[in-house]
């Protein structure tokens, strides 16, 4: 079939028809429907929602909609033995206890099955000891404590504020410092924006609000008991002692009212500088232990959560492609929530639902996409990206041969200021061109394009007149597709003004107060930002699935590779003497980047000129574009992180949420001055430069003329 037969009408007309069918009112209705009760992974309520979505996607017109189930390790509090933290006196009496649950929001007082705040996958334990305040528990915070202040965390319970980095990294750092327990809390400095009221009167975190979340260090493994393989009916499971990424010390989260009671008594060292002070009326003393009158008092944790193998359900919908059914464009987002999921994930799931409905409407009118579109409602994302990872493990052979792109669809909003996009460089031009065609929803930008408002509010730090697009990190369901399989990936959502709001994430993240009303009253009453995000995500999927030539520009990869090479070289050049001593050279990497740039340029010229009516040549050129991201995958993976295989990007070893460029070289150089064997350390730097240079050169060659 010709592409026009396949798509029934001209591509431009189809895109307009698709976008025009997306309605804010529908997204609002779907969000309400998805947020009336909790949908915790592994529960009956979430299974019922999976079946509802399956049924509705079928009604919307998808060709097939199936449930894919897996039996994975999850974690739950003990219903009859609650988790809490105490201050105990010298006789062991509990003189203060932290809260057992959050005060429910208005209208939700009689809702059952609200899971109390807990740190998922914490081991059981009742450690007691002196407290040490460790700021955000980042790598640099422990460096400050141990190296500069000479404070030893060994055998101590540490208290860290949420924010800046993924909570799992905080716990890992505390473990490495020898702590025997971790208390995580939300400081108003990070979760209470000035001039805004607490929920239910505004979008700020009340003192009794607590952030839930997993504390794993999976490094892309998926289910901790079946790394690399799907957790299916015949799976061989590791013993719990061999499970991937589980924390070894008890961990528990609290709100700032409880934190106040723990921190107000802290003695020992004063905070090293103002960056260690939050907004509570406490001294932010580091400790260890309590001050004078309270020095005999200790902190005791009571953690009784259990890890259980539990069934989870993904919903997988298929809209078969008319011309290239064996090429897959995937739109996926998770369905499971910690409680009501008003923002995370249901603001994203509602958008996916409306995108499916719009595609289904076009299909019922006789249209089909050129390529197959797969829609996914992932389960157990909150427990470590488990649903998406298990499905990708089960389907890895198909995905690595047929996967064109993955677009993620978690929370549609984390603010209402401007667009935020993280994606592969291959998608930069797609995102730019699409946002130039969409209307901005922002006040003061009526009649202007989304590109214009986005560029004005979030300018690129490198290129004037262009918007900021960030590197992909992790902490969401694109991880397995991008970091493990090398499928071009992207994500988009509306965000806050990072200049004026320096709190981490949004204040009510993972709390009981993340409700439908939070979104409808305070973030997006008209659902216009949700609609814009639907247009961006849906528009990207439409173009990726329907463009005759894939909308990837390999020249943009060349530009960033040069930037990343410059950056890592400048980091290395902080050690000029060692580079000389150990003959460390980046020549091979810069040469490979130069070759990539030249070959990408020539490929782009051929892409303009080739005969698009020749289906074999068209397919050949598209395959070179599709497989370019795959070419950056090293089958051996990164050191000690076998499931992070992308040589150009990986989640930071110090913050899972952040992306790091040339991560192998970066990690080899990190804190190299403290390594006991400098010769070995610099040898590893050289090896990583070699791997990176080889990979860039090999990727470049995939773009060369085939013969």
């Amino acid at each position: 079939k010709s592409s026009n037969e396949a798509t029934n009408i001209t591509p431009k007309h189809n895109m307009k028809a698709f976008l025009d069918e997306l309605k804010a009112e529908n997204i609002k209705k779907f969000l309400y429907n998805f947020t009336q009760i909790p949908h915790l992974a592994g529960t009956e309520q979430n299974f019922q929602l999976a079946k509802q979505i399956q049924s509705q996607w079928k009604e919307f017109g998808l060709d097939s909609v199936e449930l894919a189930h897996y039996d994975v390790l999850l974690s739950y509090p003990n219903k009859t033995h609650p988790n809490y933290i105490s201050i105990i006196n010298e006789d062991g009496n509990e003189i203060f206890n932290t809260s057992l649950f959050e005060p429910p929001p208005p209208g939700y007082e009689n809702v059952s099955d609200i899971v109390p705040p807990f740190s998922a996958f914490s081991p059981q334990g009742m450690p007691e000891g002196d407290l040490v305040y460790v700021n955000y528990a980042r790598t640099e915070d422990f460096f400050k404590l141990e190296r500069d202040m000479k404070i030893n965390c060994s055998g101590k319970i540490v208290i860290a504020r949420y924010g800046k980095v993924f909570r799992g990294n905080k716990v890992k750092n505390a473990q490495l410092a020898g702590a025997k327990g971790v208390i995580l809390y939300s400081d108003p400095a990070d979760y209470f924006a000035p001039g805004v009221k607490s929920y239910p009167d505004g979008w700020n975190l009340p003192g009794g609000g607590v952030q839930r979340g997993n504390i794993l260090n999976l490094n892309g493994a998926g289910d901790p008991l079946t790394p690399g393989y799907p957790a299916n009916e015949y799976a061989y499971r590791r013993g719990i002692a061999e499970a991937v990424g589980l924390p070894s010390i008890p961990v528990h989260p609290i709100g700032y009212y409880d934190a106040q009671k723990l921190l107000e008594k802290m003695g020992g060292s004063a905070p090293p500088d103002s960056s260690w002070r939050g907004s509570l009326k406490v001294p932010y003393n580091v400790g260890p232990g309590f001050t004078g009158n309270f020095s005999t008092q200790k902190v005791k944790m009571h953690i009784h959560s259990t890890n259980e193998v539990t069934r989870i359900y993904n919903v997988i919908g298929t809209l078969r492609g008319a011309v290239e059914p064996d090429r897959y464009v995937i739109l996926g987002g998770h369905r499971d929530s910690w409680v009501f999921g008003g923002i995370d994930p249901q603001s994203g799931a509602a958008v996916v639902h409306e995108i499916v409905r719009s595609f289904g409407t076009l299909k019922k009118e006789g249209w089909r996409p050129r390529r197959t579109i797969l829609f996914a409602s992932w389960d157990a994302e909150e427990f470590g990206l488990l649903g998406s990872t298990e499905w990708a493990e089960e389907n890895s052979r198909l995905l690595q041969e047929r996967g064109v792109a993955y677009i993620n669809a978690d929370s549609s909003i984390e603010g209402n200021y401007t667009l935020r996009v993280d994606c592969t460089p291959l998608m930069y031009s797609l995102v730019h061109n699409l946002t130039k065609e969409l209307k901005s929803p922002d006040e003061g930008f009526e009649g202007k394009s989304l590109y214009e408002s986005w560029t004005k509010k979030s300018p690129s730090p490198e290129f004037s007149g262009m918007p900021r697009i960030s590197k992909l990190g992790s902490g969401n369901d694109f991880e397995v597709f991008f970091q493990r399989l090398g499928i071009a990936s992207g994500r988009a959502r509306y965000t806050k003004n990072w200049e004026t709001n320096k709190f981490s994430g949004y204040p009510l993240y993972h709390s009981v107060y993340e409700t439908y009303e939070l979104v409808e009253k305070f973030y997006d009453p008209m659902f216009k930002y949700h609609l814009t995000v639907a247009q961006v995500r849906g528009g990207m999927v439409f173009e990726l699935a329907n463009s005759i030539v894939l909308p990837f520009d390999c020249r943009d990869y060349a530009v960033v590779l040069r930037k990343y090479a410059d950056k890592i070289y400048s980091i290395s050049m902080k050690h000029p003497q060692e580079m000389k001593t150990y003959s460390v050279s980046f020549d091979s990497l810069f040469s490979a980047v130069k070759n990539f740039t030249e070959i990408a340029s020539k490929f782009s010229e051929r892409l303009q000129d080739f005969d698009k009516s020749n289906p074999i040549v068209l397919r050949m050129m598209n395959d070179q574009l599709m497989f370019l991201e795959r070419a950056f995958i090293d089958p051996l993976g990164l050191p000690d992180r076998p499931f992070y295989r992308h040589v150009i990007y990986a989640p930071s070893s110090h913050n899972k949420y952040a992306g790091e460029s040339f991560p192998g070289i970066y990690d080899a150089l990190f804190d190299i001055e403290s390594k006991v064997d400098p010769s070995k350390a610099w040898g590893e730097v050289k090896r990583q430069i070699y791997v990176a240079a080889f990979t860039v050169q090999a990727a470049a060659e995939t773009l060369s003329e085939v013969a």
Epitope: Y84, F96, S99, F101, P103, P206, G208, Y257, D258
Partner: nanobody
Framework: QVQLVESGGGVVQPGRSLRLSCAAS????????MHWVRQAPGKGLEWVAF????????YYADAVKGRFTISRDNSKNTLYLQMNSLRAEDTAVYYC????????????????WGQGTMVTVSS
Amino acid sequence: QVQLVESGGGVVQPGRSLRLSCAASGFPLISYGMHWVRQAPGKGLEWVAFMTYDGSNRYYADAVKGRFTISRDNSKNTLYLQMNSLRAEDTAVYYCARDRIVGGRVPDAFDIWGQGTMVTVSS
């Protein structure tokens, strides 16, 4: 509208027990710390006990510690005060009061009061 209604008071002999109830309406008890306060004849107000919204912490005045127990049933929207080993000096009007801070962890100020129930301890 928002109100608290105490009940269970009466005349009781020293050494005996009594259980006071406080039914809340117009707001969810589950979100608020709650107090018992008393006023002996011709005296000022005296704070008796406080319980956090979730039941994790209970605080008592020294005069009643070990004898009185504050409790709550959030599903019934009701607060209780179990008074054992009653003494003549426990004679007072007992009021329940709502703490003004949602989710508060320690006793703060009161914002809503009941009309009180009289307890008389006399032989």
